[in-house]
């Protein structure tokens, strides 16, 4: 978790002098509770926005927006703490809006926004806005939270972001798999425009089960420049196991930008349809 660019972050608006500060996520009002505290944020909204860094890279960012309730506690509002928690790592990053002037009611509802938390593809975050000072131990909570799931690199808008492109999102291998005679699979896919090797991972399963009955790895050497964007055809030999008929083919590239952590693409071949007709019963039963 990080902030985009660390350029001057602004929270001031007409009628309010405000500064954005780094926060330890442990506001002083936790330790020294105040008697009078503001009410909670209203109508917390989160959107995925896309922002360029000063270097020109494009990153997904969480755009956080909320409004104030129109009650008298606005007079005791000293700022807000914005917290983003990445759920699978428990990593948390906070910033603090510090109000340098008193808020006054005006003709329209106060609205605040912040769009500088960089988020990762396919990650879920808990986004919390806490009004400051925080409430006394038994006081009503004055925060609002939402869990926000960022789309993965398959998403059309995410595909062109720097983190997705770095992991190979622009490569579309257009995998085709066909079953040949004599227990063979023919795998065909489009090579990317980089002289790097690929790996085909074959995993076979019984018809209705999820534990594998056959696994095979096939290495494809780095193509020459004249082979870029061409189709690569590979024939894989299967183990002759009755019922081991559902095949998952996964292609792992090793692009220089992502090495052994690139996006993988896969295709699945289902088992052939079983005939509905029952086995014929023999006319006689052998006695031995």
């Amino acid at each position: 978790l990080r902030l985009l660019d660390h350029r001057a972050l602004v929270c001031s608006q007409p009628g309010l002098n405000c500064t954005v500060k780094n926060s330890t996520c442990l506001d002083d009002s936790w330790i020294h509770p105040r008697n009078l505290t503001p009410s909670s944020p209203k109508d917390l909204q989160i959107q995925l926005h896309f922002a360029h860094t000063q270097q020109g890279d494009l990153f997904p960012v969480a755009h956080i927006e909320w409004t104030l309730q129109t009650d008298a506690s606005i007079l005791y509002l000293e700022g807000a703490e914005l917290s983003v928690l990445q759920l699978n790592t428990n990593e948390r990053l906070c910033v603090r809006f510090e109000f340098l002037s008193k808020l006054r009611h005006h003709h329209r509802r106060w609205r605040f926004t912040f769009s500088h938390f960089v988020v990762d593809p396919d990650q879920e975050y808990e986004v919390t806005v806490h009004h400051l000072p925080k409430p006394i131990p038994d006081g009503d909570p004055n925060h609002q939270s939402k869990n926000f799931l960022v789309p993965d690199c398959e998403h059309a808008r995410m595909k062109v972001t720097t983190p997705c492109m770095s992991s190979g999102s622009l490569w579309d291998p257009n995998i085709t798999v066909e079953t040949l005679e004599a227990h063979q699979l023919r795998v065909s896919f489009t090579l990317w425009n980089e002289s790097t090797h690929y790996q085909i991972l074959l995993t076979s399963f019984p018809h209705m089960e999820n534990h594998s009955c056959f696994e095979h790895m096939h290495h494809i050497p780095a193509p020459r420049p004249e082979e870029f964007h061409q189709r690569s055809n590979v024939t894989l030999t299967l183990r002759n196991l009755k019922g081991c008929c559902r095949h998952q083919v996964q292609i792992q590239p090793f692009f220089s930008s992502c090495l052994n952590d690139c996006l993988r693409h896969s295709a699945t071949v289902s088992c052939p349809e079983m005939p509905d007709t029952p086995e014929p019963i023999p006319d006689y039963m052998p006695l031995w």
Epitope: Q45, I46, Q47, L48, E65, K146, N147, F148, L149, V150, P151, D152, E154, H155, A156, R157
Partner: nanobody, 126 residues
Framework: EVQLVESGGGLVQPGRSLRLSCVAS????????MHWVRQAPGKGLEWVSG????????DYADSVKGRFTISRDNAKNSLYLQMNSLRAEDTALYYC???????????????????RGQGTLVTVSS
């Protein structure tokens, strides 16, 4: 112009099933989370269910959990709601709604619904 057109509502007996459909046009359907919301007679709008852009995540209001199933077909720009074991309290006008935000928030919209359809009426009565 964004359009959401719901269908599939009707009069049904308690315990029976219905399947609602919604066809979307005028925006990149596959980029957005979609939701079903409903409005019972004389009541406010109630969120029913949501589904992420790629169907990877689905959420339901407690009142419909285990009975309703949301799904989508991005190739057909369509959203569905399979409603089983219907009860009288499910009687409402059902709307298909588009999330304003890209991304997905569990338990409702991330950022309001910027569009919803005209609705399809579901009446559960014996």
């Amino acid at each position: 112009e964004v359009q959401l057109v719901e269908s599939g509502g009707g009069l049904v007996q308690p315990g029976r099933s219905l399947r609602l459909s919604c066809v979307a046009s005028g925006f990149a359907f596959a980029d957005y989370a979609m939701h079903w919301v409903r409005q019972a007679p004389g009541k406010g709008l109630e969120w029913v269910s949501g589904i992420s852009w790629n169907s990877g995540r689905r959420d339901y209001a407690d009142s419909v959990k285990g009975r309703f199933t949301i799904s989508r077909d991005n190739a057909k720009n369509s959203l569905y709601l399979q409603m089983n074991s219907l009860r009288a309290e499910d009687t409402a006008l059902y709307y298909c709604a588009k999330d304003r935000a890209i991304g997905y928030c569990s338990g409702g919209s991330c950022s309001d619904f910027d569009y919803r359809g005209q609705g399809t009426l579901v009446t559960v009565s014996s």
